[in-house]
Amino acid sequence: LPAQVAFTPYAPEPGSTCRLREYYDQTAQMCCSKCSPGQHAKVFCTKTSDTVCDSCEDSTYTQLWNWVPECLSCGSRCSSDQVETQACTREQNRICTCRPGWYCALSKQEGCRLCAPLRKCRPGFGVARPGTETSDVVCKPCAPGTFSNTTSSTDICRPHQICNVVAIPGNASMDAVCTSTSPTRSMAPGAVHLPQPVSTRSQHTQPTPEPSTAPSTSFLLPMGPSPPAEGSTGD
């Protein structure tokens, strides 16, 4: 005969564990139901009654099956240097990512605590290493025969155009100027751009004391421009 299905709460057989989506309550010494994502345990189980679950209050969440007495507080509202890529719901935390042109200067468990603007390389310097979602741009001086005349977080050093007759020689921050006769070879006039990083998602997971219901703001403060490194500008 098939074993009879036990309904929660029930006492587990010695040495056995509770089933999926159940937990062992030490006080009741019974296997009891967990609460589904988006809920929390309002009343813990007893020997005769199962867990009573309730929906998470405003601005709080639970992502997993659980028996926590309170849902976790959603993270603060995204700051002005961030975009909200996932809203706070009963089942998931808010996720904030750095907006284009910024990178994550201080990461946290999942995502970013503090965004900072990507460094811009000043004229005479080009991007040696592009910014990523978690690292700043690295600038380098333009080597002989190359130049950059922009203040940019994406432009690299470009070769000078080659002239039949040079009117003004190029330098690190300026292209060569040819005489009226056309140059033998000219690089494409447009600046060379490197792709912007795509930010990852971030998430807060701290409970708040007695959460009621809630919207969200941010403890994240926009950081001022990074101090200029050689060949960079905070503009």
Epitope: S59, S212, A214
Partner: antibody
């Protein structure tokens, strides 16, 4: 754009009841709470209660538990406040206001208010 | 219930003055759950500062908010004619959610 439009002013006799409506437009009713706040003449703001239109779950200030009934009809995007056993001290402007889930209760849009006058 | 006490209840100030309104909670309130509203006579309140220190779009940058625990402040760095109104703090930390009694900012 987001709008909350409330029903017009009411003049009621003591002991009567009144039902104030608040029609929402310009947003999804699913992830918001609708609050009711009252303001007696020359007085401050007083939170009465809140409804989750998606589930119908309500929460009241205990002071208004037996006085105010909150309801909503999602098919017409409207929340309702019914006040029973009206007394002269219930004379006030009643506001509906919404707070999006996840915004820690910040009421970002308000109705224009409904004046309820209780007088014999 | 958490009582919210604002001070002063009213104040008279001149255009250009720096104005500070304080809000004291009877027990600790998480900063995310503390908001300020502005109300002008005959009009509905407007959300003015959310979660202690954040300005909704359209609110001038001369307004700022700060505080934690039980003490919160709203500051106007340089009072303008359109700022004369009543300001209410509001806690959403623990139900029943409560407002301060309001601070009326009047023209001197």
């Amino acid at each position: 754009q987001v709008q909350l439009v409330q029903s017009g002013s009411e003049l009621k006799k003591p002991g009567a009841s009144v039902k104030v409506s608040c029609k929402a437009s310009g947003f999804n009713n699913k992830d918001i709470y609708m609050h009711w706040v009252r303001q007696a003449p020359g007085q401050g703001l007083e939170w009465m209660g809140r409804i989750d239109p998606a589930t119908g779950n309500t929460k009241h200030d205990p002071k208004f538990q037996d006085k105010a009934v909150l309801s909503s009809d999602t098919s017409v995007s409207t929340a309702y406040l019914q006040i029973s056993s009206l007394k002269a001290e219930d004379t006030a402007v009643y506001y509906c206001a919404r707070s999006p889930y996840g915004d820690f209760g910040a009421m970002d849009y308000w109705g224009q208010g409904t004046l309820v006058t209780v007088s014999s | 219930d958490i009582q919210m006490t604002q001070s002063p209840s009213s104040l008279s100030a001149s255009v250009g003055d720096r104005v500070t309104i304080t809000c004291t909670a009877s027990s600790s309130v998480s900063s995310n759950y503390l908001h300020w509203y502005q109300q002008k006579p005959g009009k509905a309140p407007k959300l003015w500062i959310y979660s202690t220190s954040n300005l909704p779009s359209g609110v001038p940058s001369r307004f700022s908010g700060s505080g934690s625990g039980t003490d919160f402040t709203l500051t106007i760095s340089s009072l303008q004619p359109e700022d004369f109104a009543t300001y209410y703090c509001h806690q959403y930390h623990r139900s029943p959610w409560t407002f301060g009694q309001g601070t009326k900012v009047e023209i001197k």
